[in-house]
């Protein structure tokens, strides 16, 4: 699998899309996981609804949402209020029992907000009354990693 890079701005929302063959993965739930190290396991962040028929319903885990267009074959993940610690390598997965097929490898890059001159300690966090549904989603910038590019920084 090639790795696709999605860039988002700190404090804003990033939308990651993972296209797939809808017939091949028919009836299968999907998941978004975070790769722990270059060869480490992929730790589940969020998965689609337990009932495949309801996969279109958005499910949240913290600031990460997932929704699946099972007819069109597009899995969409939203990372809300993007933070520097969200940067890293992720996977979109299709689940079959205990197995998980990788649909796409994703490298999330977090860019500094050019308009934000505040200290990191002054970063805005959502209040309880603020709805995730009203969050403004920026169009993400994505590209595939060039051959030879390393998604993880080399360790000394």
């Amino acid at each position: 699998h090639n790795t696709t890079v999605f860039q988002g701005v700190a404090g804003q929302s990033l939308q990651v899309s993972c296209p797939y063959d809808s017939m091949k993965h028919w009836g299968r739930r999907k998941a978004w996981c975070r790769q722990l190290g270059e060869k480490g396991p992929c730790q589940r962040v969020v998965s689609t609804h337990n009932l495949w028929l309801l996969s279109f319903l958005r499910r949240w885990n913290g600031s990460t949402a997932i929704t699946d267009d099972t007819l069109g074959g597009t899995l969409t993940i939203t990372l809300r209020n993007l933070q520097p610690h969200d940067a890293g390598l992720y996977q979109c997965q299709s689940l079959h029992g205990s197995e998980a097929d990788t649909l796409r490898k994703v490298l999330v890059e977090v860019l500094a907000d050019p308009l934000d001159h505040r200290d990191a300690g002054d970063l805005w966090f959502p209040g309880e009354s603020e709805s995730f549904e009203d969050a403004h989603v920026e169009h993400s910038i994505s590209r595939s990693l060039l051959e030879g590019e390393i998604p993880f920084p080399p360790t000394s």
Epitope: M23, K24, G27, H96, G97
Partner: antibody, heavy 122, light 107 residues
């Protein structure tokens, strides 16, 4: 009409190679998984493996991994089951079957081929 | 691998009888289970999918139930054409696995 038509009966000697086929018609062949199932004489059904003709993604049962090769050619809407060196214990009826698609999800194996009898004897 | 334990392995019954066959999965398979009928010399035929759904063309005397580890196929009133061997199949996890089969014979 959705159909899977399998190749005819085969009689082979131990050590010989063999490739049997399963041709789909009446539906979009590349878009449905095709499974292979073995039935030894007087015995039950055994799932061997499955292939998605659209991209030839293949999964095998550990019992059959390395013993057979499953392939497909979507341009002729045909799936194949191949042995490179047959054994007497490969004598069986082999079925291909399509994984069904239902509104609520997958529907198991909804359409079956008529079966191919393989006899391996010296 | 998920083991599917089917019981009984055979049974004798008369026309009009109510027949029940069970399949137990060694681990959770949600409702990813089907039931198949096979007559001698023929390919299997799908009777039930998703544990309890009846495909078009299958008589309503056949029904499926259960979820989690235990599933049941019921024939409400056995007909002469129902004497055959019945198999369950789990398609939740690779490798998919069949039950050992239940042969339904005439008393």
């Amino acid at each position: 009409e959705v159909q899977l038509v399998q190749s005819g009966a085969e009689v082979k000697k131990p050590g010989e190679s063999l490739k049997i086929s399963c041709k789909g018609s009446g539906y979009s062949f590349p878009s449905y998984w095709i499974a292979w199932v073995r039935q030894m004489p007087g015995k039950g059904l055994e799932w061997m493996g499955i292939i998605y003709p659209g991209d030839s993604d293949t999964r095998y049962s550990p019992s059959f991994q390395g013993q057979v090769t499953i392939s497909a050619d979507k341009s002729i809407s045909t799936a194949f089951l191949k042995w490179s060196s047959l054994k007497a214990s490969d004598t069986a009826m082999y079925f291909c079957a399509r994984q069904g698609i239902e509104v609520t999800g997958t529907g198991g194996l909804d359409v079956w081929g008529q079966g191919t009898t393989v006899t391996v004897s010296s | 691998d998920i083991q599917m334990t089917q019981s009984p392995s055979s049974l004798s019954a008369s026309v009009g009888d109510r027949v029940t066959i069970t399949c137990r999965a060694s681990q959770g398979i949600r409702n990813d289970l089907g039931w198949y009928q096979q007559k001698p010399g023929n390919a299997p035929k799908r009777l039930i999918y998703a544990a309890s759904s009846l495909p078009s063309g299958v008589p309503s005397r056949f029904s499926g139930s259960g979820s989690g580890p235990e599933f049941t196929l019921t024939i409400s009133s056995l007909q002469p054409e129902d004497f055959a061997t019945y198999y369950c199949l789990q398609h939740n996890s690779y490798p998919w696995t069949f039950g050992q089969g239940t042969k339904v014979e005439i008393t």
